[in-house]
Amino acid sequence: EEELQVIQPDKSVLVAAGETATLRCTATSLIPVGPIQWFRGAGPGRELIYNQKEGHFPRVTTVSDLTKRNNMDFSIRISNITPADAGTYYCVKFRKGSPDDVEFKSGAGTELSVRAKPSAPVVSGPAARATPQHTVSFTCESHGFSPRDITLKWFKNGNELSDFQTNVDPVGESVSYSIHSTAKVVLTREDVHSQVICEVAHVTLQGDPLRGTANLSETIRVPPTLEVTQQPVRAENQVNVTCQVRKFYPQRLQLTWLENGNVSRTETASTVTENKDGTYNWMSWLLVNVSAHRDDVKLTCQVEHDGQPAVSKSHDLKVSAHPKEQGSNTAAENTGSNER
């Protein structure tokens, strides 16, 4: 009789994560009597995967019924494969021994490669908001994929970006890999509704890439422009001054009126109007009783937007020494100045 050989017909097997791997092994003889064991890896550090004689291996089933006579098929199935299962698997025949069975012959090994999908890309922007014309960085991360080959692209509103750097780790062999990419984006005033998209393509995704998005509304700060105007007189000795706060984002805004440097009123933007580009407009007005002032009045509209240093715009009301009958239109003149 010819000496037993252990045949592992597949040099390699490729399995998708979550699926079941079949590792084939046959013996060419019933002799010697003794169990089959499966190991991952070789040498003293090898990992026992299945032992016909004893042990509990919940993820492993045998393809054939090993108790049936003449059985020489020792193939196994490993369920719920993960990237951590990748490696070379050896089917090893043991010879019955006393007290312990003795390793008799090993198969040539089957390399199990695991195809694992990348995780959904997570895009994160800068910690603090930035204003238009500034360049900000966005990062995109995806993990747990195998094999290593992967393609990552960046888009802003559907237009592909070119200013980015990507790394796949680790550089050497691993059971699974991670990708990290950083893209630079120049902000414009129109970016409140813009999106940055990170797109990851991998062999496991069958041409249907994964996408992660970041809304620039989380990143951008569009500072307001201020305009202070004097409205027609509503009543004698009264002047209505308005402060137009335009094109700001986000909405968080506090406005303070000062009369000759003294706080007259503070209010928070509430009933704002939204522009098509996603920015907001707001208007505040101040009714000034001219007769209460002997001298010229300097009115200042001071705006603190999104926790930033205040910006202000002033308006000078010149209180006339002439009698009232000159008309309220001439009771005050206005000059404007911008102050920060």
Partner: antibody
Amino acid sequence: QVQLVQSGAEVKKPGASVKVSCKASGYTFTNYWINWVRQAPGQGLEWIAMIDPSDSETHYNQIFKDRATLTTDTSTSTAYMELRSLRSDDTAVYYCAMDYGSLYAMDYWGRGTLVTVSS
Amino acid sequence: DIVLTQSPDSLAVSLGERATINCRASQSVRSSGYNWIFWYQQKPGQPPKLLIYLASNRDSGVPDRFSGSGSGTDFTLTISSLQAEDVAVYYCQHSRELPTFGQGTKLEIK
């Protein structure tokens, strides 16, 4: 180390039944056949039956087919052989034996259980 | 059913001498390229012990003075140099179909 530990000796009256147990250890119980063999005093070996604990498949010697029943309890790795309608010529040592190569052979044996049938 | 007949029923051999026990099957026990014959040794008060499987393969721990041979219907267990501890009853068994045993051969020292 494979071990098969059998239940103790039994004395039974003719017509009664006996159930002998065989507790296995040192291996995965469901992966190997268990055989039952008996030996009357001063006589040779007589094969009774075999059972596959994984699916309870059984094969019986025709002589014992109507009187013997093999069962297993996989939770305790124990095999049982019940013999009914006992006669005096059923007096024997009853052995369980494990088939390590699925060759329908007997690689590891229990120490035997003496069953005496006497009125 | 296949019947196994051993010969002789008993045998006395001097220490150091060769002992030969025969087992004849009523029909061939060869199947799938194997001869489905096994040999056991049973000492008084002990369970049998497997010596030879598939006609010619020594079980683990069995001294190499024990050997099995034969094919088809005729098989032989040979002890090349009898030792005192070899005194026992020897049984052949087939598993070409469901197992049966030979009637046994008692080996003694002359």
